[in-house]
């Protein structure tokens, strides 16, 4: 018993010791933040020069305060013992830990490319001013029906399956989280649409074939046999819709 | 040991400005900054400024940027405050004062004090 | 600004009593690096400087008698002295030693009954 009370003494007497000795072996653990220290002086604590600040203390020297600058605009006024803090002028969002960066706002039903803001394509949606444009929720996943059709800027409302539309039921569901773009059924009906689209073409083109003069068919034939080409991409190009390909990617201003 | 000897009283007028002096010696004058303290009759103590007087780097508080102006002379190891464009309200105790040691760590040393009468 | 707050504002003692006095502070003194509280306390007699007793929230200066204790951390701190004396009779002053400007309290007033 008292050989453990002796122990506890002793212990603490030993952490009381290191606490004494820590301070007059490293003095500069005696300096609060908004300070730094130089060995040099008899007064080792010296506050943090203008525009700089320490937020530990102990510091041998203080960091330079971050400026916003441009499209950055100041939150919070740098002090001796903490850091500036910025956020982004109307027209921007922060982007990264700290708004290091700061993106273009885009309007809702939009979203940003590297050539700037795009509308969505047709089956996606963006309800905000960032972020990317989400494809439109399938409703018959759900075994739903869809209510209300989808916009660039909204979501499509799914309502009840064709068979619960019975007189009493009348309930919308409101759609399921966005999911992740895939082979989602929209995308096949896209294909369908556009499989539709070549055979409506092919019928017109084959009754065009017996229908029009010699010098007409062989115009009609050079357009067709063109090798197929991506369009060349316009400089005004505000309409265009934004079909995102994996490598593309957020754009941004960095501080 | 550590002194801080400063200059005696002062009966001023309004509007005519003041220096006051305070003298140090018994230590390394540039190792430590010169801190100036104010004190109304039968009020609290309110912290002025500071110098360095090594590179004379001041700092102070705002309340105070328009009516002090602190110096030092490293040659005579004395530093100086001046009061501009004194009023009523300047009518106090002025007091330099030193860091302990490693700064931040209380005014140990202090001069005795100047006092300031501003008055028509 | 660090606004510090003494409480309170004066204090009738008598002879051998043991008194405690409270100062608390805005903003948090402690800083975290090396859990150290930047708070200084100061007695003022008549016609003098003010006395450092007490820095860094509980380490006593040098020569001042044991019967004067600093404790509290962060917001909240506290001046005990165990067993008043007649020439104990004077203001007390804290003071916020972490960040500029360094600020005052008002000071507490020990008076004898």
């Known amino acids: 018993m008292g050989n453990s009370c002796y122990n506890i003494v002793a212990t603490l007497l030993l952490v009381l010791n290191f606490e004494r000795t820590r301070s007059l072996q490293d003095p500069c653990s005696n300096c609060p933040a908004g300070t730094f220290c130089d060995n040099n002086r008899n007064q080792i604590c010296s506050p943090c020069p203008p525009n700089s600040f320490s937020s530990a203390g102990g510091q041998r020297t203080c960091d330079i305060c971050r400026q916003c600058k441009g499209v950055f605009r100041t939150r919070k006024e740098c002090s001796s013992t903490s850091n500036a803090e910025c956020d982004c002028t109307p027209g921007f969002h922060c982007l990264g830990a700290g708004c290091s960066m700061c993106e273009q706002d885009c309007k809702q039903g939009q979203e940003l490319t590297k050539k700037g803001c795009k509308d969505c394509c047709f089956g996606t949606f963006n309800d905000q001013k960032r972020g990317i444009c989400r494809p439109w929720t399938n409703c018959s996943l759900d075994g739903k029906s869809v209510l209300v059709n989808g916009t660039k800027e909204r979501d499509v409302v799914c309502g009840p399956s064709p068979a619960d539309l019975s007189p009493g039921a009348s309930s919308v569901t409101p759609p399921a989280p966005a999911r992740e773009p895939g082979h989602s059924p929209q995308i096949i009906s896209f294909f369908l649409a556009l499989t539709s689209t070549a055979l409506l073409f092919l019928l017109f083109f084959l009754t065009l074939r017996f229908s029009v003069v010699k010098r007409g068919r062989k115009k009609l034939l050079y357009i067709f046999k063109q090798p197929f080409m991506r369009p060349v991409q316009t400089t005004q190009e505000e309409d265009g819709c934004s079909c995102r390909f994996p490598e593309e990617e957020e754009g941004g201003c960095e501080l | 040991q550590v002194q801080l000897q400063q200059s005696g009283p002062q009966l001023i007028r309004p509007g005519a400005s003041v220096k006051i002096s305070c003298k140090a010696s018994?230590?390394?004058?540039?190792?430590?900054?010169i801190h100036w303290v104010k004190q109304r009759p039968g009020q609290g103590l309110e912290w002025i400024g500071m110098?360095?007087?090594?590179?004379?780097?001041?700092r102070l508080n705002q309340k105070f940027k328009d009516k002090a102006t602190l110096t030092v002379d490293k040659s005579s190891t004395t530093a100086y405050m001046q009061l501009s464009s004194p009023t009523s309200e300047d009518s106090a105790v002025f007091y330099c004062?030193?860091?302990?040691?490693?700064?931040?760590?209380?005014?140990?040393?202090w001069g005795q004090g100047t006092l300031v009468t501003v008055s028509a | 600004d660090i606004v510090m707050t003494q409480s309170p504002s004066s204090l009738t003692v008598t002879a051998g009593e043991k008194v405690t006095m409270s100062c608390k502070s805005s903003?948090?003194?402690?800083?975290?690096?090396?859990?150290?509280?930047?708070l200084a306390w100061y007695q003022q007699k008549p016609g003098q400087p003010p006395k450092l007793l007490i820095y860094w929230a509980s380490t006593r200066e040098s020569g001042v008698p044991d019967r004067f204790t600093g404790s509290g951390s962060g917001t909240d701190f506290t001046l005990t002295i165990s067993s008043v004396q007649t020439e104990d009779l004077a203001v007390y002053h804290c003071q916020n030693d972490y960040s500029l400007p360094l600020t005052f309290g008002a000071g507490t007033k020990l008076e004898l009954k």
């Open positions: 004062a030193r860091y302990r040691n490693y700064g931040y760590d209380g005014f140990a040393h």
């Open positions: 110098i360095d007087p090594s590179d004379s780097e001041t």
């Open positions: 018994g230590y390394s004058f540039t190792g430590y900054w």
């Open positions: 903003q948090s003194l402690l800083n975290s690096g090396n859990e150290k509280n930047y």
